[in-house]
């Protein structure tokens, strides 16, 4: 059994989250995860879910009685979601910590917007699209 | 030229984000995106970046002078990042709107934690890992 299971049960007690009525009015995350099978779609959703848990854990970092549980779960998330890659985890944390109300951050975000947008489509990053367009044009020109 | 480019230039003026000094102290997003080539890693990062922009745009939704620009950019993000899939965009928005300080939300999140964790590894959802382990065991047993 993964170490997180026991610690998650401890958190359930702490948050009073074991009762059946907690499941009333549908799920938060599980229903959404069920909708997406494609790995890249799942990563889009899981990214938001993991950042939610990180925020929640951060808010309760001073509660001694769950500190060990929180640390164990975070470590296990690190293994499972970030593949134990510290750089990946650090970059992710950086992104989640930017303040959306800080004018300097806002300016930088707007400054980078065009380039960010250009990279959003899966094809964009490799230059595949450009290459195939050029091949297509070249073919037409030589006909 | 994509429609977002002109509108992003308009936002640059509005936020005074065209000056070279905006780029001081490194980038917010571009440097991080450069680190990740693998599509699923990029989606993890882009998910946070897109939610940052959505939050930023939401904060400025009452500023008439940039409303058209914001709407155009959001629509283009929808096309590029969510592949014009309304369900995907809606699920994403749902996740970004959960309040991390609401006890009922906290309870649900903790209630779902074990199942969420079980799905975090790429192999988890398809049962690939189990299948390959069984094949490996079978092979060893038949040698």
């Amino acid at each position: 059994q993964d170490p997180y299971v026991k610690e998650a049960e401890n958190l359930k007690k702490y948050f009073n989250a074991g009762h059946s009525d907690v499941a009333d009015n549908g799920t938060l995350f599980l229903g959404i995860l069920k909708n997406w099978k494609e790995e890249s779609d799942r990563k889009i959703m899981q990214s938001q879910i993991v950042s939610f848990y990180f925020k929640l854990f951060k808010n309760f970092k001073d509660d001694q009685s769950i500190q060990k549980s929180v640390e164990t779960i975070k470590e296990d998330m690190n293994v499972k979601f970030f593949n134990s890659n510290k750089k990946k985890r650090d970059d992710f944390e950086k992104l989640t910590n930017y303040s959306v109300t800080d004018l300097n951050v806002q300016r930088k975000a707007i400054h980078e917007l065009i380039q960010v947008m250009a990279e959003l489509s899966p094809a964009a990053k490799t230059g595949k699209r450009k290459r195939s367009q050029m091949l297509f044009r070249g073919r037409r020109a030589s006909q | 030229q994509d429609p977002y480019v002109k509108e992003a230039e308009n936002l640059k003026k509005y936020f005074n984000a065209g000056h070279s000094d905006v780029a001081d102290n490194g980038t917010l997003f571009l440097g991080i995106l450069k680190n990740w080539k693998e599509e699923s890693d990029r989606k993890i990062m882009q998910s946070q970046i897109v939610s940052f922009y959505f939050k930023l745009f939401k904060n400025f939704k009452d500023d008439q002078s940039i409303q058209k620009s914001v709407e155009t950019i959001k629509e283009d993000m929808n096309v590029k990042f969510f592949n014009s899939n309304k369900k995907k965009r809606d699920d994403f928005e749902k996740l970004t709107n959960y309040s991390v300080t609401d006890l009922n939300v906290q309870r649900k999140a903790i209630h779902e934690l074990i199942q969420v964790m079980a799905e975090l590894s790429p192999a988890a959802k398809t049962g690939k890992r189990k299948r390959s382990q069984m094949l490996f065991r079978g092979r060893r047993a038949s040698q």
Epitope: K13, Y14, N16, D63 | D102, L103, Q106
Partner: nanobody, 126 residues
Framework: QVQLQESGGGLVQAGDSLRLSCAAS????????MGWFRQAPGKEHEFVAG????????YYADSVKGRFTISRDDAKMTVSLQMNSLKPEDTAVYYC???????????????????SGQGTQVTVSS
């Protein structure tokens, strides 16, 4: 030891607003979760709203969701309850209470809380 004193009650019309305040004295107010309860004549104490340390967890009774807002100021050692769109059924004595452990606080049972005040009367006429 924490002493709690509620204020801000009164007689108002349906649809009006009121802001209740609870002043704490004693040590380490910031380490307590706070809750507002109410008791209508002849009824049990009913949980209204709760706020955990530094506001990292909040919850409301379904009957007041969207109308009442709880907040705290640890520097001033106060917890407030902003009550909007009041209804006659909100009429009760309102008590503020303090609890030191999260699992007990989040169950929202008046008898389980460590400390409570004397209450302030809120009357909403139609």
């Amino acid at each position: 030891q924490v002493q709690l004193q509620e204020s801000g009650g009164g007689l108002v019309q349906a649809g009006d607003s009121l802001r209740l305040s609870c002043a704490a004295s004693g040590r380490s107010f910031s380490s307590y979760g706070m809750g507002w309860f109410r008791q209508a004549p002849g009824k049990e104490h009913e949980f209204v709203a709760g706020i955990w340390r530094s506001g990292v967890s909040l919850y409301y009774a379904d009957s007041v969701k969207g109308r009442f807002t709880i907040s705290r100021d640890d520097a001033k050692m106060t917890v407030s309850l902003q009550m909007n769109s009041l209804k006659p059924e909100d009429t009760a004595v309102y008590y503020c209470a303090a609890e030191a452990t999260f699992p007990t606080w989040n169950r929202g049972r008046f008898a389980d809380y460590d400390y409570s005040g004397q209450g302030t009367q809120v009357t909403v006429s139609s």
